[in-house]
């Protein structure tokens, strides 16, 4: 079973003498999700050659995965804490439909996929408490998400494998960008 944040994990140092601060909790939580993604990527790469494929652009056309850009205020040049937090939360909310898609894509790591999805929901809640400008956060339309999910699930096997690989790779990159930006706050 997946190790929950707060329990022993390979990327957590000596126990804290005091309760975790909000920033520390968020940081630890992201690292926990990254652990989960790592496990899921292992299974994906073991069962298909998607991780070495050069045909990623074909599948990427169907996806609109959130990505950090300079205008989002999370990069050092033009860093803006409020704008950046809005981008992080909005991006995580946009990833939720893709994490839902991943739920039936794993055999041996089914629990891990669920843990990544649930931990992301918790992370969004942590970050929403930290954000001042909640009005600026746009939540994806449920109907849009539902039709996107249907479309993704209707793809052929090769495209579904490629989509799984791309979601995991992009989510990992997005979380790494989050980790970096949040540590500057």
């Amino acid at each position: 079973a997946p190790v929950l944040p707060g329990e022993d994990s390979k990327n957590v140092a000596a126990p804290h003498s005091q309760p975790l601060t909000s920033s520390e909790r968020i940081d630890k939580h992201i690292r926990y999700i990254l652990d989960g993604i790592s496990a899921l990527r292992k299974e994906t790469c073991n069962r298909s050659n998607m991780c070495e494929s050069s045909k990623e652009a074909l599948a990427e056309n169907n996806l609109n995965l959130p990505k950090m850009a300079e205008k989002d205020g999370c990069f050092q040049s033009g860093f803006n804490e409020d704008t950046c937090l809005v981008k992080i939360i909005t991006g995580l909310l946009e990833f939720e439909v893709y994490l839902e898609y991943l739920q039936n894509r794993f055999e041996s790591s089914e629990e891990q996929a669920r843990a990544v999805q649930m931990s992301t929901k918790v992370l969004i809640q942590f970050l929403q408490k930290k954000a001042k400008n909640l009005d600026a956060i746009t939540t994806p339309e449920p109907t849009t998400n539902a039709s996107l999910l249907t479309k993704l699930q209707a793809q052929n096997q090769w495209l579904q494998d490629m989509t799984t690989h791309l979601i995991l790779r992009s989510f990992k990159e997005f979380l790494q960008s989050n980790l970096r930006a949040l540590r500057q706050m």
Partner: antibody, heavy 122, light 107 residues
Framework: QVTLKESGPTLVKPTQTLTLTCSFS??????????VGWVRQPPGKALEWLAF???????YYSPSLESRLTITKDTSKNQVVLTMTNMDPVDTATYYC??????????????WGQGTLVTVSS | DIQMTQSPSSLSAFVGDGVTMTCWAS??????LNWYHQRPGEAPELLVF???NLQIGVPSRFRGSGSETYFTLTINSLQPEDSGTYFC?????????FGGGTKLEIK
């Protein structure tokens, strides 16, 4: 096998601009979580971090030197370039480039170049 | 900026001895602390990342510990090749900062 190597002038005159190139192999600077940094060490002194560039082109500079530094990358050539303007004798040091690459962004430099000694003198 | 302070600035010990050096951060950095070893005329080498994780290939006689603002590096059963200078590094946030170093002499 991951390797990095610094190249550039060994001697520069005061007020001149120093351009150092870090050529690397064994990894890609387009992989998420990967970055390359520059660190210098004046003779007999401690390490001083100068600049850092990430896979997505996010750049960080030492606040005390920011106005003089520029870091850029050429992913296709596997190179990172550092320029430092208005060189002064106190900038005499061994300049290292180093790689950081881990999922959790621990900002740890796991592989270093051999370093290049730059002397600033007229 | 986060200031890093190392103590002692130098120490000497015999082969087979154990030593401990410390590093303080001016504010909490969680477990984001790295240790490096540098021999004269050579580039630094990563020993420990994230306060307590040994870098691949580093002997188990090295041990890092600590969190928040106080960190230690312990070397058991010293070997001649352990001589040199040890640097700690704030890896929590930019600007990255190094400690002044601890110079270890093996007698």
């Amino acid at each position: 096998q991951v390797t990095l190597k610094e190249s550039g002038p060994t001697l520069v005159k005061p007020t001149q601009t120093l351009t150092l190139t870090c050529s690397f192999s064994g990894f890609s600077l387009s992989t998420s979580g990967v970055g390359v940094g520059w660190v210098r060490q004046p003779p007999g002194k401690a390490l001083e971090w100068l600049a850092f560039i990430w896979w997505d082109d996010d750049k960080y500079y030492s606040p005390s030197l920011e106005s003089r530094l520029t870091i850029t990358k050429d992913t296709s050539k596997n190179q990172v370039v550092l320029t430092m303007t208005n060189m002064d004798p106190v900038d005499t040091a061994t300049y290292y480039c180093a790689r950081s690459a881990d999922d959790y962004l621990y900002y740890s430099f796991d592989t270093w170049g051999q370093g290049t000694l730059v002397t600033v003198s007229s | 900026d986060i200031q890093m302070t190392q103590s002692p600035s130098s120490l000497s010990a015999f082969v087979g001895d154990g030593v401990t050096m410390t590093c303080w951060a001016s504010q909490s950095i969680n477990d984001y602390l790295n240790w490096y070893h540098q021999r004269p005329g050579e580039a630094p080498e990563l020993l420990v990342f994230a306060a307590s994780n040994l870098q691949i290939g580093v002997p188990s006689r090295f041990r890092g510990s600590g969190s928040e603002t106080y960190f230690t590096l312990t070397i058991n059963s010293l070997q001649p090749e352990d001589s040199g200078t040890y640097f700690c590094q704030n890896a929590h946030s930019f600007p990255l900062t190094f400690g002044g170093g601890t110079k270890l002499e093996i007698k």
